[in-house]
């Protein structure tokens, strides 16, 4: 595999990880994949300090971030685990909300205006925010 | 100058199978997203597959889920498509295209010629 | 999958008009909408990006406007070179990016 040893250009470099801002929506799906194809993901929040670093990017704007609960349990999309790792949560969040109209419950996860998490409908055209490590081996599948 | 030379193209009967390549030149090949779009004879413009810089992320439409396999060596510059179970419907034009994200959006700033695939018994 | 519907599917034209096509989206795509030129045994070539930000190297009587879900080429002053196939192309739906049908520009 390669390793990437510097951020692309127009991504932020913070703490050995590259961050990309987006300035417009997606549904969480299409900004996960979107992410992915960037060979990044959606932005996993593993600390104060990291939550302060994008908090100060994206402004008071809804954000999408990499945690959704659409299979079960709250999940991050890189594997970190939810249980034992950080969290930001609104006062009575998450909470699954089904009063919307739009069907069914919350499932995806978003930086609020004050930068705090909250679960919503995750069709919602939300910004976004990638991130991919600097020094990590990207592992290239074996060809067929 | 960037370059996406496609081949492999030619005639199969239904069934069968077919690897398409896509050798690329001009650019870092390993830092693009690539994608194949096809075109049916007099027809429109179909998206059928993309794969991330590093090969690690593939996606498919669901016309070809299950049948095609896209893929890529970065060491050769090189983009695959392999087509398993053809079927009539699948015969087009297939064309490789570089993708790239700019402000949030993608699009395709560079295809190559094409390679017809006809599938017919 | 997000629907994509251009209009109209051919028109003709003489060098020096002003024409404009139109692509609708079966749902708000936001500004997620790409042209493309084809001219026939060609590859298609990028034109506008963003809705409405010319690719490099394109001549500027093309532009492109709109968001939401209707959308619109332009071609400010029609010359030999443009007679082709056009098509849209959402890309808010990642990465199932579907096309329109394409207009086919003719000389009249």
């Known amino acids: 595999g390669s390793e990437r040893t510097c951020c692309p250009v127009n991504w932020v470099e913070h703490e050995r990880s590259c961050y990309w801002f987006s300035r417009s929506g997606k549904a969480w799906a299409d900004a996960d994949n979107y992410c992915r194809l960037e060979d990044a993901h959606l932005v996993v929040v593993t600390s104060w300090e990291e939550q302060k670093f994008v908090q100060h990017h994206i402004g008071p704007v809804n954000t999408w971030m990499g945690l959704h609960d659409q299979n079960g349990p709250w999940k991050w999309v890189d594997g970190t685990d939810y249980e034992t790792g950080f969290k930001n949560w609104r006062p009575e969040q998450p909470d699954d909300w089904y009063g919307h109209g739009l069907g069914g419950g919350e499932d995806c996860a978003h930086f609020t205006d004050d930068g705090r998490w909250n679960d919503d409908v995750c069709q919602r055209p939300y910004r976004w925010v990638c991130e991919t490590e600097l020094d990590k081996a990207s592992q290239e599948p074996p060809l067929l | 100058e960037v370059q996406l030379l496609e081949s492999g193209g030619g005639l199969v009967q239904p069934g069968g199978s077919l690897r398409l390549s896509c050798a690329a030149s001009?650019?870092?090949?390993?830092?693009?997203?690539m994608s194949w779009v096809r075109q049916a004879p007099g027809k429109g413009l179909e998206w059928v597959s993309v794969?991330?810089?590093?090969?690690?992320?593939?996606f498919y439409a669901d016309s070809v889920k299950g049948r095609f396999t896209i893929s890529r060596d970065n060491s050769k510059n090189t983009l695959y498509l392999l087509m398993n179970s053809l079927r009539a419907e699948d015969t087009a034009v297939y064309y490789c295209?570089?993708?790239?994200?700019?402000?949030?959006?993608?699009?395709?700033?560079?295809w190559g010629q094409g390679t017809l695939v006809t599938v017919s018994s | 999958d997000i629907q994509m519907t251009q209009s109209p599917s051919s028109l003709s034209a003489s060098v020096g008009d002003r024409i404009t096509i139109t692509c609708r989206a079966s749902?708000?795509?936001?500004?997620?909408l790409n042209w493309y030129q084809q001219k026939p045994g060609k590859a298609p070539k990028v034109l506008i990006y963003a809705a409405s930000s010319l690719q490099s190297g394109v001549p500027s009587r093309f532009s492109g406007s709109g968001s939401g879900t209707d959308f619109t080429l332009t071609i400010s002053s029609l010359q030999p070179e443009d007679f082709a196939t056009y098509y849209c192309q959402q890309s808010y739906s990642t990465p199932t990016w579907t096309f329109g049908q394409g207009t086919k520009v003719e000389i009249k």
């Open positions: 295209a570089k993708k790239i994200a700019v402000a949030g959006t993608h699009y395709f700033d560079y």
């Open positions: 001009g650019f870092t090949f390993s830092s693009y997203a």
């Open positions: 749902q708000s795509i936001s500004s997620y």
């Open positions: 794969i991330s810089g590093s090969g690690v992320n593939t």
